[in-house]
């Protein structure tokens, strides 16, 4: 079960979806993507304290063991829980074509 959404570290410090603007050059895509020329990349960024947005029992255990053995067990990571699809117009060997990527943009985030 996904646990609490209250962030003990203060606003915007805990795991959440954030939008980062990136050019094709920033992403290293300029040689194969034609459009969009700038991507609003939704990413999962932030800390995963206590039981914040724990994705499952494994994440809860990880949090507990991290408190006990921080040198051995890493804290849970903020990762996408689901994705929004996005279409790219790309160059291929046979010409320009469309390709939809189902896992390019984070929709919402959790800790795992």
């Amino acid at each position: 079960a996904r646990n609490g959404d209250h962030c003990p570290l203060g606003p915007a410090a805990c795991c959440a979806a954030h939008t980062v603007r990136a050019s094709l050059e920033d992403l290293g895509w300029a040689d194969w993507v034609l459009s969009p020329r700038e991507v609003q990349v939704t990413m999962c960024i932030g800390a995963c304290p206590s039981q914040f947005r724990a994705a499952n029992m494994h994440a809860q255990i990880k949090t507990s063991l991290h408190r006990l053995k921080p040198d051995t067990v890493p804290a849970p990571c903020c990762v996408p829980a689901s994705y929004n699809p996005m279409v790219l117009i790309q160059k291929t060997d046979t010409g320009v074509s469309l390709q939809t990527y189902d896992d390019l943009l984070a929709k919402d985030c959790h800790c795992i």
């Epitope: 459009s35 929004n84 699809p85 996005m86 279409v87 117009i89 320009v96 939809t100």
Partner: antibody
Amino acid sequence: QVTLKESGPGILQPSQTLSLTCSFSGFSLNTHGMGVGWIRQPSGKGLEWLANIWWNDDKYYNSALKSRLTLSKDTSNNQVFLKISSVDTADTATYFCAQVAWDWFAYWGQGTLVTIS
Amino acid sequence: QIVLTQSPAIMSASLGEEITLTCSASSSVRYMHWYQQKSGTSPKVLIYSTSNLASGVPSRFSGSGSGTFYSLTISSVEAEDAADYYCHQWSSYPWTFGGGTKLEIK
């Protein structure tokens, strides 16, 4: 495989409202960068862009016709709707809908002929 | 709005001939698309963003240009190229098409 199909009344009278439906398959308007555009073509003449509706419900209209155009979508049923109010004989044309990916009319419907008479 | 003027309005070409269709914009645009429309069918894209061939389009088609002047070249015209050709800009709304060039084969 992407397909689009336009449907409309065929014939209607001046001053009425033209209602067009674009039914599509093979893509989703939940996909970022995806939209549906409307273009019309009077017989024997060139193409005129009318409007686009996007995945995020942004709508853009041809400024010359904006006051008469209304766009909407039903994402779950893969349909887009265009209404043109107060039609006259100058609106007689074949109306196309097309899949728009960012800036590209990638796939087009076969078109539906609308006659104002 | 940006007005696109295509010339010539009608072009007649012989099989195997190289031809160039032009599109002039009333103000500068970043890129141009080119569409082909054969009689009784819907348009299809030939050139994406000035010079990129769309998937499945024969290599005899090519595009170039910048600013206010763009062109579409067919290096060796074939009978199946008889069609109307439209340039299209999306640099600013409203998106606009050129008036078209009708290519006839002698």
